[in-house]
Structure formats: C-alpha cells, structure tokens
C-alpha cells in the first residue's frame, strides 16, 4: 500500500537534483581556482542536511548555516550587481563584464539557480512530486528560505556603489515584495554602501519615456534615502545595444545614450 504523501501546490524537486547540485559544484570549483579547496561531497551533504527529514514548511536560516560556511567566497564588495525580474540580462551582463557578480555567479547561487527542492518530515526521501508554493502553502519552505538567506548575505557584503538591474516592462518596476525589495534593499549596510544605482531596462523599441520617474522608482528612492544611502537611476533604452557596448566600448555608436 503506497504511503500517504503531502500534496503541495508547487512543482516537485527538480529531477536528478542531487546529481545536478554535485555536478554544478564540481564544474564551478574547476572553473574558479579560488574555490578549488571546496569538497563538493561535503557541500552536497550540507545542502541535503538543510532540508532532508524536515517539514518543508518549517525550514529556518539556521538550517542552511553549515552550507553557508562551506560555500564561503569573498566577493569584491564594490562589484555587486543585484537584479529584480530581469535575471537573464543581468547574467548576460556579468558574463561580459567579468569583474562584476550577481548572486548566481557565486558558488551558492550557481548551485541552486532555477532548481526546486524539498523533503518530507521524518523520512530521508526527496519529494519529487510536489513542494510548497510560497503563496499557496508556506513561505518558510526550503527554496524560499535558501534564497532569502543567500540574498541577505550577498546584500550585506556590498560596498561603495551597488548596481541593481530592474525590469522596465513590469507594472511594478520596483516591487517591494520581490527578493530585492523585501530582503536585499533592507540589508545594504549604510556604513559602507554609498550609492544604489538602478538601471531600468526598457522593453519596447520605441520606448523613450524616462522610467526613472516611475512612482515605484520614487518609492525605492525614498526607502534608500531613509537608510542614508544615496540613490541614482539610469534608463537603459536599448538593452541589446547596452550589452554590445559593454563588449565593445570603443565602438563609435557607444558614446550616445543607450
């Protein structure tokens, strides 16, 4: 008789999750010499230990503490790029601008990017059928708590000028409920962060509006200013040209506004 299993509203653990995490760890540590000391089996054990046999609605930041310690990686604090609802362009940018880092350019972010995982209380099984949805089931689920934990720490590490890429095509360009709006903004350290610079990415070819005047951007400016951090904003009217100019800054067409 099959055991009763909790049905959650969200998709289940990504297939071949253990193999994927281990393979990503090995690949990352091979590419990044400063992380060659990392024992990927220990990393997987710590990752697994954070959620296996635990109720998937009762995960805490402390559960991820051993993984956070094993994944310690000093990031140049003045080269941090945050993003909200525009991950692909942010990643394309750091692939070209190699000295800048999104969270997913770190080992911990790279391991978990686009994956889903959860376990079941009191069994060592990984749940491949369903996992808790943040809205419909619970917020303290393994995936949400992981991203909240690493995002908080990533923002805490930032200094000088911090950049954030925002999606100008969304109804809320800045969303207080996004990871950026609810976690990262509030964990920038005013003692060492001088300025948050927002890059608002335009979607439409003929969109010449100044999206830095959008009410949600003004809301972001207000939140940041109250935290004694300066705020600046730039429109990126042509994201394709923007990337091209990052690749080839000497190009004559790159002196004009992008």
């Amino acid at each position: 008789v099959p055991r009763w299993r909790q049905q959650w509203s969200g998709p289940g653990t990504t297939k071949r999750f253990p193999e994927t995490v281990l393979a990503r760890c090995v690949k990352y540590t091979e590419i990044h010499p400063e992380m060659r000391h990392v024992d990927c089996q220990s990393v997987w054990d710590a990752f697994k230990g954070a959620f296996i046999s635990k109720h998937p609605c009762n995960i805490t930041e402390e559960d991820y503490q051993p993984l956070m310690k094993l994944g310690t990686q000093t990031v140049p604090c003045n080269k941090i790029l945050l993003w909200s609802r525009i991950k692909d362009l942010a990643h394309q940018f750091t692939q070209v601008q190699r000295d800048m880092f999104t969270l997913e350019d770190t080992l911990l972010g790279y391991l978990a990017d686009d994956l889903t995982w959860c376990g079941e209380f009191n069994t060592s099984k990984i749940n491949y059928q369903s996992c808790p949805d943040w809205r419909k089931d619970c917020s303290n689920n393994p995936v949400s708590v992981f991203w909240k934990t690493v995002s908080r720490r990533f923002a805490e590490a930032a200094c000088d000028v911090v950049h954030v890429m925002l999606n100008g095509s969304r109804s809320k360009i800045f969303d207080k409920n996004s990871t950026f709006g609810s976690v990262e903004v509030h964990n920038l350290q005013p003692e060492k962060v001088q300025t948050l610079e927002a890059w608002v990415i335009h979607g439409g070819r003929e969109d010449s509006r100044d999206l830095c005047q959008d009410p949600t951007i003004k809301e972001l400016e207000s939140i940041i200013s109250k935290r004694n951090i300066q705020f600046s904003c730039k429109n990126i009217y042509r994201p394709d040209k923007f990337l091209q100019c990052v690749k080839n800054p000497e190009d004559s067409s790159c002196t004009s506004e992008i």
Partner: nanobody, 116 residues
Framework: QVQLQESGGGLVQPGGSLRLSCAAS????????MGWYRQAPGKQRELVAA???????NYADSVKGRFTISRDNAENTVSLQMNSLKPGDTAVYYC??????????WGQGTQVTVSS
C-alpha cells in the same frame, strides 16, 4: 584594515573562570558569524563556540554547559565566558569572523592555561 584583538587569557586554577573578549575593528561585526576556536600544542584547531549574525549559538560537546558565547554588536565585541575550567581546556584561543560573501578573519590568539 580588519583587526580582531583577543584579550582576557591567562593562568587559572581548575574549576576557575575566565572571560575572553574579542574586539573587532574595520568590519561591521553585526553581519558576521562569530566563533571561538582553540588549538592545544600538537593538536588541530577546533571550534569551541559560535554565534550567528542572528544570534543562534552552538557549542562543542566538551564545553556545553560550561562556556557561553555572546556578542555586543554596538560595541563590536564578542565574548566567551568560561566556567568550571579543566586542564583539558588549556590552549591558545582564537576569535574568528566569518561571512559567506564578505570574508573570513582571525585574531592572533590569547593563551589560556588551566593548572594548579
């Protein structure tokens, strides 16, 4: 320039108490997970006690119930209260600051000797 400066070590009789303190400069202590490690002659460095940035603590089995770690973020210090000391606690004690993305730092160490 990041500095972790330990103080409070010394010679104490078995059953006695000491309070070690670690003063941090050049870092925002509140975002760091802090720990006390010790190294006895000819042995590996081992974790004694740790406190996360959110205040959760954990201890080596050998010191549970005897040692207490605490932090004062306003003063940028972390302390280790050591009671019921035993000869086996004799070691150099090191302060450690660890942040997933902001770096790992060590103090120079302070000697603790438990002997009658």
């Amino acid at each position: 320039q990041v500095q972790l400066q330990e103080s409070g070590g010394g010679l104490v009789q078995p059953g006695g108490s000491l309070r070690l303190s670690c003063a941090a400069s050049g870092i925002i202590l509140r975002i760091y997970d802090m720990g006390w490690y010790r190294q006895a002659p000819g042995k590996q460095r081992e974790l004694v006690a740790a406190i996360t940035s959110r205040g959760s603590t954990n201890y080596a089995d050998s010191v549970k119930g005897r040692f207490t770690i605490s932090r004062d973020n306003a003063e940028n210090t972390v302390s280790l209260q050591m009671n019921s000391l035993k000869p086996g606690d004799t070691a150099v004690y090191y302060c450690n600051a660890d942040h997933t993305f902001a770096g790992v730092y060590w103090g120079q160490g302070t000697q603790v000797t438990v002997s009658s």
